[in-house]
């Protein structure tokens, strides 16, 4: 037999079929000009010491092959002595280590089979009412196919599906849309109402992500707010990875989820812009402020659930840091300033109270003074902290007020608000004998010492009505008691209390009259 | 190795109707074209019908509109439903690879056309 022609004798080695699953396959058998066709397959398995064999046999039953050596493409002419212009069925014989191995027949009419291309360049993916939709421009001068597409997850193998016929000059497919699992697709074509034409190759993997992203699953932890005033959000875990399909796995566009970070942040609600969203990747500093936090993770059909977490305010204390003068104009704050050019935002709420009820005000962006203080001042009429009631205050800082990530918190403390001088008066002062020559005085707590750091001490005034001589004693604020000794028997004393704070001098309570009185011995 | 089973022949009235099976094993049986043959008594072994690993089938003139073939490749069978019989059907019939038929044959199944 002549290379150039099917030979219609006995192939070279015996008929017989391993069975095996390597092999040859996917046979493609086209016409690629007037008058010469070619047929390609693929052989799957150890390559060394193969040879293949191109059989074809006629519809009267007469078959006939071409050696193709190890070659995995062959060429013949119309003049090979395989018909043409009527169906034949062709196989690929492959014989290696003494057994043949055969790929799938292909049944077909070689001069009408033109090659077909799978679909090349972008596969748009969308969703459609639940399922996947594939789109793409159908590849020139091949109007008319027929479709298939094949899926796996990366726990299932392929599976073959049906895309129906295409006769426009774009082709789409709807195929199924796995809810959590990634999928991986591959869509070929044949020539539409041509019996028996050759599928073409796959097409490049398609990586389409499942429809609902993965939930994220992370932890998170916050520093200490440092000496800036700001402390650092950490990410303890990381996302858990999208497991992918095989031909997925490395570079996948498509399947790519996202996470973002949500921050919500709760105090100092004047500020112009509560949220702020980030990339994961990408931990931020945040103020000593209570924040909520959400990571969102989305993929290309959208967003998917979120984990959401609180992160309570810092709620450490400086009571020193903050000075209060009382006028008759107002009230005025003033702290360690920042830097040039700031803005502060004051945040004030009675203590005990939802932090939902929080008020605040928004300075303009202001320098230190001459001292290198910030300053806030308010009116009575305001009505700015003006119960007589203990305040928490916060104070955060930005040069940049409008991005929620530059805020840091300058000081928290306690404010005592209203009239605090005549609020703060002891009451319920009353004296006891304790000696010949002493008393114990004794008095309610005062309403400053139910904020933490306001109330500097207790001051206890005794006078001695005949000598007026006045004697004052400091006492803890946390103390409510003091023994006033050395005093003299039949004389009268008043005795009065009042509540100091670091910056103003407290209202004496009313006088309270006592003496000792004159043991008369037997 | 390659086995071929066929099953369903018997005897019939003409214009009756039979169903003939057969099962295959020992080789990739959806890669492949299948046909059924026939061998009359005295009388060259002939092709009735073919059927394609695509589906497609084609009968030979004698048989066309009275035979059909069909494949079910999850049960590796073939079968070849056979109605308004003849006399001049009567013969061995036999199931095997189309192209090309193999040395291996089945034992056939007798299918006998008489009033």
């Known amino acids: 037999c002549r290379t150039s022609e099917c030979c219609f004798q006995d192939p070279p080695y015996p008929d017989a079929d391993s069975g095996s699953a390597s092999g040859p396959r996917d046979l493609r058998c086209y016409r690629i000009s007037s008058d010469r066709y070619e047929c390609s397959w693929q052989y799957e398995g150890p390559t060394a010491g193969v040879s293949h064999f191109l059989r074809c046999c006629l519809s009267s039953g007469r078959c006939c092959y071409f050696a193709a050596g190890s070659a995995t493409r062959l060429q013949f002419s119309d003049q090979a002595g395989v018909s043409v212009l009527y169906t034949v069925t062709l196989w690929v014989e492959s014989w290696a280590r003494n057994q043949t191995e055969k790929s799938p027949e292909v049944t077909l009419q070689l001069y009408n089979s033109v090659k077909y291309e799978p679909p090349l360049g972008d596969i748009k993916v969308s969703k459609l009412a639940g399922q996947l939709r594939m789109e793409w421009e159908t590849p020139d001068n091949q109007v008319g196919a027929e479709v298939q597409f094949r899926h796996r997850t990366p726990s299932s193998p392929w599976k073959l599906g049906d895309c129906g016929p295409q006769d426009d000059d774009t082709e789409s497919c709807l195929c199924p849309l796995e809810m959590n699992v990634a999928q991986e697709f591959q869509l070929r074509r044949r020539q539409l109402g041509s019996q028996g034409s050759s599928w073409s190759k796959w097409s490049s993997p398609v990586c389409v992500p499942p429809e609902n992203p993965p939930q994220p699953q992370v932890r998170f932890s916050v520093e200490q707010l440092g000496q800036d005033g700001r402390r650092r959000l950490t990410l303890k875990e990381q996302p858990t990875q999208l497991e992918l399909p095989e031909g997925c796995q490395g570079l996948a566009p498509g399947t790519e989820v996202t996470y973002r970070l949500q921050l919500h942040m709760l105090s100092c609600p004047c500020k112009a812009k509560a949220t702020r969203t980030l990339h994961l990747g990408k931990m931020p500093y945040l103020s000593g402020a209570a924040y909520n936090v959400a990571v969102i993770s989305s993929n290309q059909f959208g967003p998917g659930l979120n984990q959401t977490w609180h992160i309570p305010a810092d709620t450490h204390t400086e009571p020193v840091a903050l000075n209060i003068s009382v006028g008759t104009n107002g009230t005025t704050m003033y702290w360690p300033a920042r830097a040039q050019s700031m803005t502060y935002c004051i945040e004030w709420q009675p203590v005990g109270q939802d932090g939902g009820l929080a008020t605040c005000s928004l300075t303009a962006p202001q320098d230190p003074d001459p001292a290198g203080m910030a300053t806030y001042s308010w009116s009575r009429e305001s009505g700015a902290m003006g119960q007589e009631k203990c305040y928490y205050i916060t104070i955060f800082a930005s040069a940049h007020p409008e991005k929620l990530t530059l805020w840091s918190t300058v000081l928290s403390t306690y404010h005592f608000g209203g009239n605090a001088s005549a609020a703060g008066t002891p009451h319920h002062v009353s004296v006891k004998n304790h000696s010949l020559d002493s008393v114990s005085v004794d008095w309610a707590p005062s309403l400053l010492s139910t904020c933490p750091g306001v109330l500097k001490e207790y001051v206890v005034r005794c006078r001695d009505e005949d000598s007026k001589q006045v004697s004052e004693h400091p006492v803890q604020p946390t103390e409510t008691q003091v023994t006033l000794s050395g005093l003299r028997a039949g004389v009268a004393y008043t005795v009065q209390v009042r509540a100091d704070t670091a910056w103003l001098r407290g209202v004496w309570s009313q006088p309270q009259r006592f003496s000792i009185e004159v043991q008369v011995s037997d | 190795e390659v086995q071929l089973v066929e099953s369903g022949g018997g005897l019939v009235q003409p214009g009756g109707s039979l169903t003939l099976s057969c099962t295959a094993s020992?080789?990739?049986?959806?890669?492949?074209?299948m046909g059924w043959y026939r061998q009359a008594p005295g009388k060259q072994r002939e092709l009735v019908a073919a059927?394609?690993?695509?589906?497609?089938?084609n009968y030979a003139d004698s048989v066309k509109g009275r035979f059909t073939i069909s494949r079910d490749n999850a049960k590796n069978t073939v079968y070849l439903q056979m109605n308004s019989l003849k006399p001049e059907d009567t013969a061995l019939y036999y199931c095997n690879r189309r192209y090309p038929p193999d040395d291996y044959w089945g034992q056939g199944t007798q299918v006998t056309v008489s009033s």
């Open positions: 020992g080789f990739r049986f959806s890669d492949r074209s």
């Open positions: 059927i394609t690993v695509g589906g497609s089938t």
